[in-house]
């Protein structure tokens, strides 16, 4: 059974992940329209189901494309200090949270998503899991 310390650690990791995803989303929402329009042609895959930590496998598999689009879209109005480090940190958290005991084959929804929809989906996921832990 999970101990209170392991639950607290999971909660802190989820909060860290949530903040990272929100930071990216805030940066994107600050884009001027034409640039955002171009970014929205970059497609992301969404999980068919995301209700448990193990479903973070679906986020892990889309981190490379996320890093790509953030690198491509850097500008004065949106400059992440180091995209590679940010994605690497997210990846570390995701790996710890989902665990490695069971390797899940991610099931994706038929419809793809824009970067904004993709980030919102995973932000909602983090918020939902955090609320069950508190």
């Amino acid at each position: 059974a999970p101990t209170s310390s392991s639950t607290k650690k999971t909660q802190l990791q989820l909060e860290h992940l949530l903040l990272d995803l929100q930071m990216i989303l805030n940066g994107i929402n600050n884009y001027k329209n034409p640039k955002l329009t171009r970014m929205l042609t970059f497609k992301f895959y969404m999980p068919k189901k995301a209700t448990e930590l193990r479903h973070l496998q679906c986020l892990e598999e889309e981190l490379k494309p996320l890093e790509e689009v953030l690198n491509l879209a850097q500008s004065k109005s949106f400059h992440l200090r180091d995209t590679k480090d940010l994605i690497s940190n997210i990846n570390v958290i995701v790996l710890e949270l989902k665990g490695s005991e069971t390797t899940l084959m991610c099931e994706y929804a038929d419809e793809t998503a824009t970067i904004v929809e993709f980030l919102n989906r995973w932000i909602t996921f983090c918020q939902s899991i955090i609320s069950t832990l508190t």
Partner: antibody
């Protein structure tokens, strides 16, 4: 090896229908846009439109909207370009090309060998 | 639509000599304040499919020799070949992907003198 293989040359009469294909291999076909480019005899390249096979999201250049239909079958990693009623002016070489996860942020890095379409009575 | 204009239409070249092709767009191809310039160069060799040479203004595509280079800013762009080789003959096209629909230049035919 990453490649796009197109269907063979076609000779058709005006008013006939046609569907040409472009089969991708060696990469995740569903995760990259596939564009279609026309080259009329002795002329330059014209960008016709594009499809994302993962969800069949399709965008057409205004010049080609309503003239052709772009589709894809992700189960067999194939994109299609079709005409319901061919005209003599559709005589051209047609190329498919891969364009990454966003057609704004990636060049057309892999091209098919082209399909020659001849429309003549 | 963004119109792409290439000059010259035809370019006779001498092997070993440099060559330069110009491309002009009707609006700036800069993506955002200091983002990427969304311009590519393609080469179509005789009887072949086009191939990507240079992407995002100045990045050489995989396998492209370093004698090819792309430069420019805003609306004026140049493709340079430092020392032309016989295998470089064909038609060169610039293409913008800043705005939909994507558009090609009319092409520049490079041939050996």
């Amino acid at each position: 090896e990453v490649q796009l293989v197109q269907s063979g040359a076609e000779v058709k009469k005006p008013g006939e229908s046609l569907k040409i294909s472009c089969k991708g291999s060696g990469y995740s076909f569903t995760s990259q846009w596939i564009g279609w480019v026309r080259q009329m005899p002795g002329k330059g390249l014209e960008w016709m439109g594009i499809i994302f096979p993962g969800d069949s999201d399709t965008r057409y250049s205004p010049s080609f909207q309503g003239q052709v239909t772009i589709s894809a079958d992700k189960s067999i990693s194939t994109a299609y370009l079709q005409w319901s009623s061919l005209k003599a002016s559709d005589t051209a070489m047609y190329y498919c090309a891969r364009q990454g996860r966003s057609y704004h942020y990636y060049g057309m890095d892999v091209w098919g060998q082209g399909t020659t379409v001849t429309v003549s009575s | 639509d963004i119109v792409m204009t290439q000059t010259p239409l035809s370019l006779p070249v001498t092997p070993g000599e440099p060559a330069s092709i110009s491309c002009r767009s009707t609006q700036s191809l800069l993506d955002g304040d200091d983002g990427n310039t969304l311009l590519d160069w393609y080469l179509q060799k005789p009887g072949q499919s086009p191939q990507l040479l240079i992407y995002t203004l100045s990045y050489r595509a995989s396998g492209v020799p370093d004698r090819f280079s792309g430069s420019g800013s805003g609306t004026d762009f140049t493709l340079k070949i430092s020392r032309v080789e016989a295998e470089d003959v064909g038609v060169y096209y610039c293409m913008q992907r800043l705005e939909f629909p994507l558009t090609f230049g009319g092409g520049t035919k490079v041939e050996i003198k």
